[in-house]
Interface confidence: medium
Amino acid sequence: RGVFRRDAHKSEVAHRFKDLGEENFKALVLIAFAQYLQQCPFEDHVKLVNEVTEFAKTCVADESAENCDKSLHTLFGDKLCTVATLRETYGEMADCCAKQEPERNECFLQHKDDNPNLPRLVRPEVDVMCTAFHDNEETFLKKYLYEIARRHPYFYAPELLFFAKRYKAAFTECCQAADKAACLLPKLDELRDEGKASSAKQRLKCASLQKFGERAFKAWAVARLSQRFPKAEFAEVSKLVTDLTKVHTECCHGDLLECADDRADLAKYICENQDSISSKLKECCEKPLLEKSHCIAEVENDEMPADLPSLAADFVESKDVCKNYAEAKDVFLGMFLYEYARRHPDYSVVLLLRLAKTYETTLEKCCAAADPHECYAKVFDEFKPLVEEPQNLIKQNCELFEQLGEYKFQNALLVRYTKKVPQVSTPTLVEVSRNLGKVGSKCCKHPEAKRMPCAEDYLSVVLNQLCVLHEKTPVSDRVTKCCTESLVNRRPCFSALEVDETYVPKEFNAETFTFHADICTLSEKERQIKKQTALVELVKHKPKATKEQLKAVMDDFAAFVEKCCKADDKETCFAEEGKKLVAASQAALGL
């Protein structure tokens, strides 16, 4: 069954239940509900999921039974609207329930919260986790799905099933190991880090679809798939792009059952047609479904076909350029993007999209000119500065990273971004700058040919985090401008921002710089975050402070924490030495 050929089903819920099986059906409904109602207790969600599942089973037995012909949005929306505390817990979101489909679902989607007010997930002791896992494996795994889904309301649902499978495997193996902690903790750390990255990548896909439309997402997909499958024909890439767009549109729209079903179909299609797609798919296609889909999504680029002809012949020198463009603009531009991307695995996707946009703009202008060919003859020369800009930026920043190391590189970015957009909340600036700083460890180790796709496409993901967090509570016109004007130019837009001269420095508040003995028991990462939070606050108080001044204050701060954490009476040390540090810092910065 192809992704698009669906037989008419009397009951959509029965159809999906049969396609996905009970276990996946229940897991996906739980994810969907937790992503919509992020504050509801676990037990309430489990109850709702069980009710939906029982109903689905009646429809499998008899598709003509009452309500079985209703759409999934109607069934799920009706179920969510039975939650008694909807008004108290969610406020105006309860108004969604007064609407009819499809407006009701759109309303629920608009109320998804990228930064929900939920407590940080604290990892219990290993023995406690293993006991819980053995006592009730099913509940333990459901709890994992629930906790991730409610904190990441756009997490790619079929991929979350894959994470849950790995989570289960980690506990199954490690809870029997001699040293449970040594076995389990690294696996959980890896899942946590991969999960955060996966969530952020999917958030960019959803933002691309929702804020910039299907055309923007399709352009991204053409470029990425052409790099990954350079031996595939253009028509084949177009087919994959169309199907992939449908899958992500569904997941981003909350249609998780359809999304998971269609993703499985797409993986099946790719594996059945791997000869005409890529030579790198063989291993992926031997794996079970969830692993297979994940593997295909991460598969390395195939080798480029030998002796690809020059692009200029068809896209610059041909007398038919304007004719081909006029007849079907998007197909011709799609072919251009495909041809360019398959030849350039060394470029970031966003760079390829900038080049395609420049080509489109040139044709729009030149095909209306008196001598079109003369007008667009030098279009490829316009690409040179666009290519050099990210190359130079990556070179400079990788040199800085190698010189400073990750922590100090993050601090340099913290200062840089706080000066650009000081109105943004301190937690957001810390989170985003820390993630921006991770580009160094992630990408600078790669050879030149892999650096740009690694770095710039990763930065697009991180800057999208800034954009979605800022959208919730907009405070900076500059952030809004960079986030909304052009998806592919977000990174250059932020890079081009200088110090915000209009910013009125924040009033000095000694409380912000008061620390206690609890800092001594924090992990290295949490201690870094405390110090980086203080650094952002310093810059907000004194945006014109020099690098040297800030370094001096931060060095003093590090020495202060180290000294007091070694003291016998830590709390007294923090109180007394802290006052001295604040006074010295004020003097050093001229506050």
Epitope: F4, F234, A235, K239, T242, S276, D314, E339
Partner: nanobody
Framework: EVQLLESGGGLVQPGGSLRLSCAAS????????MLWVRQAPGKGLEWVSV????????YYADSVKGRFTISRDNSKNTLYLQMNSLRAEDTALYYC????????????WGQGTLVTVKS
Amino acid sequence: EVQLLESGGGLVQPGGSLRLSCAASGFTFDTSSMLWVRQAPGKGLEWVSVIHQSGTPTYYADSVKGRFTISRDNSKNTLYLQMNSLRAEDTALYYCAKFPSSRMKFDYWGQGTLVTVKS
């Protein structure tokens, strides 16, 4: 040897309909994307529509969008073009072709079928 044989052309009044067929042989039809191309009298070639080997997706030139529908039957090795709301400017020789592997060059052509739209 690759063969593509078009049929179904003819004379039709503006607003009328026609269905073109293209029988393919000599290559693996079900793994090939196909397209319809046309050439109006005294004009250059214009591509009309493309269909992927599996039947989706399909693409149309802006000039025919909403009026023409491309389809295929892989079990019969046949490509179709359903043309509705025909206009005088649709008058042309219609060819079916195997979609190019990458560049804008068409690998194999039929001999064409003539569509004439006039009152």
